[in-house]
């Protein structure tokens, strides 16, 4: 299937040679090397790791490896003035204080520069007041509180459990509800799997463990001070008051031991239903405030973190293409971690390192890919996808003209149950075909393909005999490439069994306990799942860079467009009277989808039949495939989210991690029954249908015969 003119390896063995060179033992060794000390963005340790990776990628054989630096806004706790939360009595005395740090894991007691748990970009402040428990602080949780329970969060400190949605959305929702502070905590219901011990005896979260993380609402902007443009030496920076996405109220995370002390005293309203109860031995009362005996006690936050413009470093490696050097396939993952990064990101960075080594080995044997492969070790992902976004802003003109695909490589594992893939529909067939050729690492599937075990364990909800592939959302470094630039993107990792494990992410996410030992002892002792992920990510990159015809199938986009149109139409049809009153029609969208389907089908037929030995026609057809994703980009962006420009997909306005289809229409319809001006609201729905229909039709036309 893959071939290349510039090689001394038999073409049909190229992919096999690449895959055979990937070794689990190397991934293990690289993971160990990357996780012995913290690599927080903006620190000397992370700069040193960048230089080490640069040096090793050069040794591996890449043509060039450069550091790309930017000066971006980061956030750190004050070393001499720690952040904490108190319960204070009526005299203002602090009768309980939350912990100042996580108890370090065994073997790491003497490691310096472990950043204590904090919410990055929290403003400073010392608010005090009554507590309100807001469940997950989702949009629907605040609807329940405000509309059904008539509880007012204005002037209150809210406590929310982590999980379900991106923490930045929780903070935004709390701000909109009028809260003056937010406490985030990990409830065992979400971060403690039954029957598993807590670290260091198992992979569960101990009571003193805390999830760090940024609480920005950047909506794809990158560095908050330089939205749209790279944070380079001559950048014009906004004032902090004009910075994009910063929270306006203090926020701090705690573990469940500390949360217990706050929640056990809660009074006021009982929880509205069982979905508001976690696993702590507390009433999960909503409040506001504490119960009877403790009603005079208040909660006080002490937040002293600072925002600082700090230098970050991406590592960019190039393996020049032999035939189409001006076509870029990018494999990127971040390097910065909150602490040791045992899973996030180093389980991904170790896989990238081994992929680079394998490609380098082939190159040293005289092989080159057809297209250029760019490898990236991004910085400051944890602070808002800053490294990848700044680099893409700096190179946007090249990327929009030359970018074929972006494959993301953050954490390789979040479990060890089955494969998880999120990607553009253009890559569905690539992923299916590749996984059919790879061996499954799963117990009970010896001698079977990865496709088979994946399909059995994670079946598609729509198509029998096929695996589930999810929409791309955000919260990772593919965001700028896909949502802003319209470059076909995908990601793959091993995941947990979502049916039996309802906890959010993996329990030790962003805690000090995310160590090498966590992976080596509990998740993947043989590193066989890491190897499988390396084969999937590396195999995708290999095919994208090396196949003569790009491995994109535009017919799969047609199928999902119809599905998404049906879904958004169903949502709208919950308001049949208003649709009639305001003459809302989806005919234009369905017509555009129908046209897209027909044109995509004809294009696919031509793709089978054209003369692949004619380099001009080959390049023309490949360009139509490459630019199809680009055709879904609206240069004006989505309403109030100018850097989310993809009309088919955007991160959900209610959860950055989740992807939403036809997001413009979806947001226009959301909670429309509560809008004060229905005529205006339905007018916006009609405008969004028009934008979507036009975009789908325009994209279809890029696949038509050129003349």
């Amino acid at each position: 299937k893959s071939s290349n003119e510039a090689t001394n390896i038999t073409p049909k063995h190229n992919m096999k040679a690449f895959l055979d060179e990937l070794k689990a033992e190397n991934i293990k060794k690289f993971l160990y090397n990357f996780t012995q000390i913290p690599h927080l963005a903006g620190t000397e340790q992370n700069f040193q790791l960048a230089k080490q990776i640069q040096s090793q990628w050069k040794e591996f054989g890449l043509d060039s490896v450069e550091l790309a630096h930017y000066d971006v806004l980061l956030s750190y706790p004050n070393k001499t003035h720690p952040n904490y939360i108190s319960i204070i009595n009526e005299d203002g005395n602090e009768i309980f204080n939350t912990s100042l740090f996580e108890p370090p894991p065994p073997g790491y007691e003497n490691v310096s520069d472990i950043v204590p748990p904090f919410s990055a970009f929290s403003p400073q402040g010392m608010p005090e007041g009554d507590l309100v428990y807001v469940n997950y602080a989702r949009t629907e949780d605040f609807f329940k509180l405000e509309r059904d329970m008539k509880i007012n969060c204005s002037g209150k400190i809210v406590i929310a459990r982590y999980g379900k949605v991106f923490r930045g959305n929780k903070v935004k929702n709390a701000q909109l509800a009028g809260a003056k502070g937010v406490i985030l905590y990990s409830d065992p219901a979400d971060y403690f799997a039954p029957g598993v011990k807590s670290y260091p005896d198992g992979w569960n979260l101990p009571g003193g463990g805390v999830q760090r993380g940024n609480i920005l609402n950047l909506n794809g902007a990158g560095d908050p001070l330089t939205p749209g443009y790279p944070a380079n030496e001559y950048a014009y920076r906004r004032g902090i008051a004009e910075a994009v996405g910063l929270p306006s109220i203090p926020v701090h995370p705690i573990g469940y031991y500390d949360a217990q002390k706050l929640l056990e005293k809660m009074g006021g309203s009982a929880p509205p239903d069982s979905s508001w109860r976690g696993s702590l031995k507390v009433p999960y009362n909503v409040g506001p405030g504490f119960t009877g005996n403790f009603s005079t006690q208040k909660v006080k936050m002490h937040i002293h973190s600072t925002n600082e413009v700090t230098r970050i470093y991406n590592v960019i490696g190039t393996l020049r293409g032999a035939v189409e050097p001006d076509r870029y396939v990018i494999l990127g993952g971040h390097r910065d971690s909150w602490v040791f990064g045992g899973i996030d990101p180093q389980s991904g960075a170790a896989v990238v390192h081994e992929i680079v080594r394998s490609f380098g080995t082939l190159k040293k044997e005289g092989w080159r890919p057809r297209r250029t492969i760019l490898f990236a070790s991004w910085d400051a992902e944890e602070f808002g996808l800053l490294g990848s976004t700044e680099w893409a802003e700096e190179n946007s003109r090249l990327l929009q003209e030359r970018g074929v695909a972006y494959i993301n490589a953050d954490s390789s594992i979040e479990g060890n149950y089955t494969l998880r893939v999120d990607c553009t529909p253009l890559m569905y067939s690539l992923v299916h075909n590749l996984t059919k050729e790879l061996k499954s690492p799963d117990e009970g599937f010896e001698g079977k393909s990865l496709y088979e075990s994946w399909t059995k364990k994670s079946p598609s909800p729509e198509f029998s005999g096929m695996p589930r592939i999810s929409k791309l959302g955000s919260g990772n470094d593919f965001e700028v490439f896909f949502q802003r630039l319209g470059i076909a993107s995908g990601r793959a990792r091993y995941t947990k069994n979502w049916e039996t494990n309802k906890f959010s992410g993996y329990p030790l996410y962003h805690s000090v306990y995310e160590t090498y030992e966590l992976v080596e002892k509990f998740y993947d002792p043989m590193f066989k799942y890491h190897l499988t992920v390396a084969q999937v990510r590396g195999g995708m990159v290999f095919e994208l860079a090396n196949s003569i015809v790009l491995p994109f199938d535009c017919r799969d986009y047609a199928v999902v467009l119809r599905k998404y149109a049906d879904k958004i139409y169903s949502i709208s049809m919950k308001h049949p009277q208003e649709m009639k009153t305001y003459s809302v029609s989806f005919d234009s969208l369905f017509s555009a989808v129908k046209n897209f389907t027909e044109i995509a089908s004809k294009f696919s037929e031509r793709l089978q039949d054209f003369d692949k030995s004619n380099p001009i026609v080959l390049r023309m057809m490949n360009d139509q495939l490459m630019f199809l994703e680009r055709a879904f980009i609206d240069p004006l962006g989505l309403p109030d989210r100018p850097f989310y420009r993809h009309v088919i997909y955007a991160p959900s306005s209610h959860n950055k991690y989740a992807g939403e289809s036809f997001p413009g229409i979806y947001d226009a319809l959301f909670d429309i029954e509560s809008k004060v001006d229905p005529s205006k609201a339905w007018g916006e729905v009609k405008r969004q249908i028009y934008v979507a229909a036009f975009t789908v039709q325009a994209a279809a036309e890029t696949l038509s015969e050129v003349a």
Epitope: G208, Y257, K261
Partner: antibody
Framework: QVQLVQSGAEVKKPGASVKVSCKAS????????INWLRQAPGQGLEWMGG????????NYAQKFQGRVTLTIDTSTSTAYMELSSLRSEDTAVYYC?????????????WGQGTLVTVSS | DIVMTQSPLSLPVTPGEPASISCRSS???????????LHWYLQKPGQSPQLLIY???NRFSGVPDRFSGSGSGTDFTLKISRVEAEDVGVYYC????????FGGGTKVEIK
Amino acid sequence: QVQLVQSGAEVKKPGASVKVSCKASGYTFTYFDINWLRQAPGQGLEWMGGISPGDGNVNYAQKFQGRVTLTIDTSTSTAYMELSSLRSEDTAVYYCARDGNFPYYAMDSWGQGTLVTVSS
Amino acid sequence: DIVMTQSPLSLPVTPGEPASISCRSSQSLVHSNGQTYLHWYLQKPGQSPQLLIYTVSNRFSGVPDRFSGSGSGTDFTLKISRVEAEDVGVYYCSQSTHVPTFGGGTKVEIK
């Protein structure tokens, strides 16, 4: 490892008071409540009260209200139980026990016990 | 207070044979969070009590798998699948859903 070490046996006269200590080690003292229980000779276990080292909050069994005082010294990770107005029926082994936090919410570690004998 | 009633008071057993102890509470032990905080302790002769089973059915660290707990609401059972000589002592059920209380104990002894 978690350890609770109690003070030694005491012999008291009726009407006197006794103060038993319980020194904790091997864990973060402020995260776990300390319970006090007693066991009269040949009898079962009876809960007397509990104290939260994190915030000093105290709960007493109704039976002992006004006669028992629970305190803590966080600087030495030590809990204390003082029982006043002793009578002969207070002769018992007194135990401190750590109240396991999630996922146990049970008394997961016990002191060795302190025998208090009330006799004239 | 919740009253915990254990039966039997005394249980003579043969090593290798199973044993079962019953515990009944005067009211439901289901907490508002849905959990049931019913626990079992063993007090070996001359020792402090030790936790065996927490929240009805979960074995505490180091407890052999011959011990199992079950039940719901107000009725609970501790089972020993094959009694060993080291299992002798007094077994107590206890609840911590409300103010902690204990059963009167069941003395397990070798026949």
